[in-house]
Interface confidence: low
């Protein structure tokens, strides 16, 4: 159907599309329309799409009106729910998406006489698809302007954009489905074809002989049989056969006859001949025992000399019968064979629950322990296990004794202590039970026999130098008086412990407080600040390395204090004309002694071995398979004796050679069948069978004959900056920093700076490996002293 | 198709020697690349490799085991056997037996398993 | 050291994808061999070498191995796959084997 809304209508002076007004006069002044609004409502024609609309024609798709819904101006977008300003167009074909539209606005005359007059008209040629969404439209131009909205929605069960798709959801014999936002079919589970009314049969039914009419199921065809209608049906009463067709019966081995009942090696399936006895077939479900001498009968079951195999056990005499032999049996042993034990506990002869055991022709009876002899029938002593363990006596009674307990004992043996401990301990002390009796362990603090006096620990008068002595429980408190301490007031505090004197300041205790004897460069309350000499004593620069000032600490009244431009590593050399050199120590060299000789130039390491400059030193970390101070040895990989079956081995670089013996192949000889298995090529490499011999093929980062040697790569170019050694790691590396430098690539620069080398507020600048100070206004020197 | 079969008693007690032979149907233990091993379970734990033996004689013993045990072969009988001395209760297992190609660590062939249980 | 490391237990919703780790020194030189053991019964050899299967051992069964890990994957995994697995390869020295302590998979 197609709706359509009005929303709006702006008709300000209340005049119609010819200039009238709705109501009649104009007011002579301001000739605006005046007594009563314009009553209006509105009308509707749907056609066919014209690219020029005519007005005139038949509204093809339909036509409508609203009854009166407003006056000159209104809005009705916020009312929802009123059918007034709605007009409904039902159409009962496709939808052909384009369409004209003529929405005129009337003003209703109320009176049957006049006729109703036209406000404004709007006309839209368009273009629209079936939604549940508006189309907001609207008419501006004119006396009047209105505004509304359209849409086309498709019946139940129509879908697409011309509302000619049917879809009606089933779930019956004709189709099981639901649709979806497009109307396509969409089956219920275990259903499908165009119309969903094929069922989906069992996953795995035979699609040749298996059908169902209901999803999951699986119905055979006659002849076949199943879960799955896969399998055959054999003849019926087939015993020891297959079919691979229905009705068929194809016999197993052995099995003959039209249902394969007959056994054509009866022999074989149940062994019938006896003693030793040979069978033989001779026809379906037929044999023949040939007999070993002595035996006789169709299964040479018979013996001839029965008695000559000692047949009867137990020391039973044996007689030959016509059946064969019969047993005589000795006293306590029955049977065919004297084999079986009479049970001389059946009935059982033992009184007073005991236990019948069963002998060789007679019985032993287990009694419980109130009961003795050869049945159980006599009274034991109890008395006599002396079972009473703190008793003045013990009295045997029937089945049964009885102790008669010291005091403080109890129990059927007196061997329980009674308890005498009853909540007689005061002040949580604990009760240790006594015989016939008890004893209070009072916690510390208190005494008494039940615990019951507080100890009053002051009474020794233990606070010393005046202290005043607080009683507690299990405890005493002295309180102090001032400048003394300790549990007992027996410290003069120690306003040195600990120590508040730094930089090596010796600390002394006095009444109430402490005093810090500074060494020479340092001052305040605890020494804890550098001493700026040049204020207090004059100095004296010596030459360029030493500067000189006057002090208590040394006998000749002069303190000589050296620059420490040369760092750890030298020694400040005064030259002429303020300048210095530095004497390095061994393995260093540099204007300020902070280089480290490169121990490595010579190259020493051999065979590919990577050099570690050290101070004065070098250490060699040799390649893979070589060892020694300059990897100069090649390691021996034949020490182990790995050559299998006779094998030669012989040493390679990290490797070894097996020259095989006798057949055997692999890298060990192991092997008859086979050069490769998964130990040949190391660290992932590929082996190849190739006869004779075998091949690795290597992963990325190894070489060698079995991949064991790792390749520089790693190291290719030099991945170490400012330097740096690199030493190759597997298919990685690390790299070796130069002093100065650090991080995995020795790409930081060390702080030189740390920790402050400037003295007077100088400032440092941080180096490769060098520092510079920046003096303050009236400082200089190499560390502005 | 190769089938090992273990025999031997069920029951040891302490400070006896265990004793266990495995038979070898469909395959020969002469065949040239075959390692016959025996490996133990003790009850709700893992898998125990306790040692293997080639057709030549040569042997090789988990460390852990080496000095109370001994694997032996009968080439003729299609046989191999293991002695375990001094046992425990720590030695109550499922023994298996096992063939393993020249991967030596790959046990293609299992016997189904016997329990043997150390208590006086 | 000449051990193998396998987690006690993991488990596996029915149809996901499970993996088992097997670590170890070893495993740098030498491949390891999976085995799948149901309770009351011998162990099974399910992968072994670089990733080879047995005949008879579905292709859901997938090895790899990295470093010195060895991983067992099974991919869609189905309720017969429940069991203990265990992993083991020759020692660093070769000359004796090793096996890992076991991984107990149940799917869900």
């Known amino acids: 159907q197609f709706e359509l809304e009005i929303l709006s209508m702006q008709n300000v002076n209340g005049e119609l599309q010819n200039g009238n007004c709705c109501g009649g006069a104009r007011n002579p002044g301001d000739r605006k329309c005046t007594r009563d609004e314009c009553d209006t409502y509105f009308k509707v024609c749907l056609k066919e799409y014209q690219s020029r609309v005519t007005a005139g024609g038949p509204c093809s798709f339909g036509s409508g009106s609203t009854p009166v819904i407003g006056g000159n101006t209104f809005n009705l977008k916020a009312s929802r729910g009123n059918d007034r300003n709605r007009i409904v167009l039902p159409f009962s074909f496709a939808w052909p998406r384009s369409y004209t539209l003529l929405v005129e606005a009337w003003d209703s005359s109320n009176d049957t006489v006049q006729p109703d007059s036209i406000i404004e008209k709007a006309s839209h040629s368009g273009m629209i698809n079936p939604s549940r969404q508006w189309q907001t439209l609207k008419q501006n131009t004119g006396v009047a302007h209105f505004e509304y909205q359209i849409r086309v929605t498709c019946d139940d069960y129509y879908y697409g954009f011309g509302c000619n798709k049917f879809c009606r959801p089933r779930d019956d014999f004709f189709g099981h489905y639901a649709c979806d936002q497009n109307g396509n079919k969409t089956c219920m589970e275990g259903w499908m074809g165009p119309e969903c009314n094929r069922a989906i049969c069992r996953q795995g039914c035979s699609p040749k002989h298996g059908s169902c009419k209901l999803p999951g199921d699986c119905r055979c065809q006659y002849g076949w049989q199943g879960l799955y209608c896969d399998k055959c049906i054999p003849h019926p009463g087939c015993v020891h056969g297959i079919c691979n067709e229905p009705w068929q019966c194809l016999c197993e081995t052995n099995w003959g006859g039209q249902l394969c009942d007959k056994d054509l090696n009866y022999c074989g399936t149940h062994q019938p001949c006896l003693n030793g006895g040979t069978c033989s077939n001779t026809g379906p479900d037929k044999y023949q025992c040939s007999c070993p001498e002595g035996y006789s009968g169709p299964n040479c079951e018979i013996a001839e000399h029965a008695c000559l195999s000692d047949p009867c056990h137990n020391r039973g005499s044996c007689k030959e019968t016509s059946l064969g032999f019969e047993c005589e049996c000795s006293p306590g042993w029955t049977g065919p064979t004297c084999s079986t034990n009479i049970d001389d506990c059946s009935p059982n002869n033992c009184s007073h629950g005991g236990t019948c055991q069963d002998l060789v022709n007679g019985f032993k009876c287990v009694c419980p322990p109130q009961w003795t002899g050869k049945t159980c029938q006599l009274d034991a002593n109890e008395c006599e296990a002396k079972p009473c363990v703190n008793a003045k006596s013990c009295k045997n009674l029937i089945a049964s004794y009885y102790c008669d307990c010291l005091p403080g004992w109890m129990g059927q043996n007196c061997d329980i202590n009674i308890n005498d401990c009853l909540g007689q301990c005061q002040n949580d002390a604990s009760c240790r039970d006594l015989v016939n009796g008890y004893r209070c362990i009072c916690p510390p603090g208190y005494a008494g026999d039940h615990c019951e006096r507080d100890i009053d620990e002051c009474a020794s008068n233990p606070c010393l130098n005046g202290g005043h002595c607080q009683n507690e429980i299990n405890r005493f408190q002295c309180l102090c008086p001032t400048g003394f301490s300790g549990n007992l007031c027996q410290l003069d505090i120690d306003y040195c412990e600990p120590n508040p004197c730094q930089n090596g300041a010796q600390c002394y205790n006095r009444a109430s407080d402490y005093f810090c004897k500074c060494p020479e460069d340092y001052e305040g309350k605890n020494c804890s600040h550098l001493k700026d000499h040049c204020r207090t004593t004059p100095c004296e620069v010596i030459d360029s390395c030493t500067v000189a000032m006057a002090s208590n600490d040394t006998p000749e009244g002069v303190r000589y204090i050296s620059s420490n431009v040369c760092g750890p590593h030298g020694k400040c050399k005064s030259q002429s004309g303020g300048k210095f050199t530095c004497d390095c120590n061994k393995g260093f060299t540099g204007t300020y002694c902070h280089e480290n000789i490169n121990d490595c130039e010579s190259n020493p390491c051999r065979n590919g071995g990577t050099c570690i400059d050290g101070v004065n030193s070098y250490k060699c970390i040799c390649s893979d398979g070589w060892e020694g101070a300059y990897c100069e040895t090649n390691i021996n990989d034949c020490s182990q004796n790995p050559c299998h079956n006779g094998g030669t081995c012989r040493d390679l670089v990290n490797d070894f050679y097996c020259d095989c013996k006798n057949g055997w192949k692999g890298k060990t000889c192991h092997s008859r069948d086979s050069q490769c298995d998964e130990a040949t090529c190391n660290n992932g490499g590929t082996c190849y069978d190739e006869g004779d011999a075998f091949k690795c093929m290597c992963p990325g980062g190894w070489e060698g004959t079995t991949c064991n040697i790792a390749r520089n790569s790693s190291c290719l170019p030099n991945p170490c900056h400012n330097g740096g050694t690199c030493v190759v790691n597997g298919e990685s590396f690390t790299c070796v920093c130069k002093e100065g430098w650090e991080g995995p690539i020795c790409a930081q620069n060390t702080n030189d700076c740390s920790p402050h080398p400037c003295y007077n507020s100088g400032t440092c600048v941080d180096g490769d490996n060098w520092y510079r100070c920046e003096c303050a206004p009236g400082f200089a020197g190499p560390d502005c002293r | 198709q190769v089938q090992l079969q273990e025999s031997g008693p069920g029951l040891v007690k302490p400070s006896e020697t265990l004793s266990l032979t495995c038979t070898v149907s469909g395959g020969s233990v002469s065949s040239g690349g075959d390692y016959w091993s025996w490996i133990r379970q003790p009850p709700g734990k893992g898998l125990e490799w306790i040692g293997y033996i080639y057709y030549t004689g040569s042997t090789n013993y988990n460390p852990s085991l080496k000095s109370r045990v001994t694997i032996s072969v009968d080439t003729f009988k299609h046989q191999f056997s293991v002695n375990l001395t001094s046992v425990t209760a720590a030695d109550t297992a499922v023994y298996y037996c096992?063939?393993?190609?020249?991967?030596?660590?790959?046990?293609?062939?299992w016997g189904q398993g016997t329990l043997v249980t150390v208590s006086s | 050291s000449s051990e193998l490391t396998q987690d006690p237990a993991v488990s596996v919703a029915l149809g996901q994808t499970v993996r088992i780790t097997c670590q170890g020194d070893s495993l740098r030189t030498y491949y390891a061999s999976w085995y799948q053991q149901k309770p009351g019964q011998a162990p099974v050899l399910v992968i072994y070498?670089?990733?080879i299967r047995p005949s008879g051992i579905p292709d859901r069964f997938s090895a790899s191995r990295s470093g010195n890990t060895a991983a067992l994957t099974i991919t869609g995994a189905q309720a017969e796959d429940e069991a203990d697995y265990y992993c083991?390869?020759?020692?660093?020295?070769?000359?004796?084997?090793?096996f890992g302590g076991g991984t107990k998979v149940t799917v869900l």
């Open positions: 096992a063939r393993s190609g020249v991967a030596m660590a790959r046990f293609d062939y």
């Open positions: 083991n390869s020759r020692d660093s020295s070769g000359d004796h084997v090793i």
């Open positions: 070498g670089k990733n």
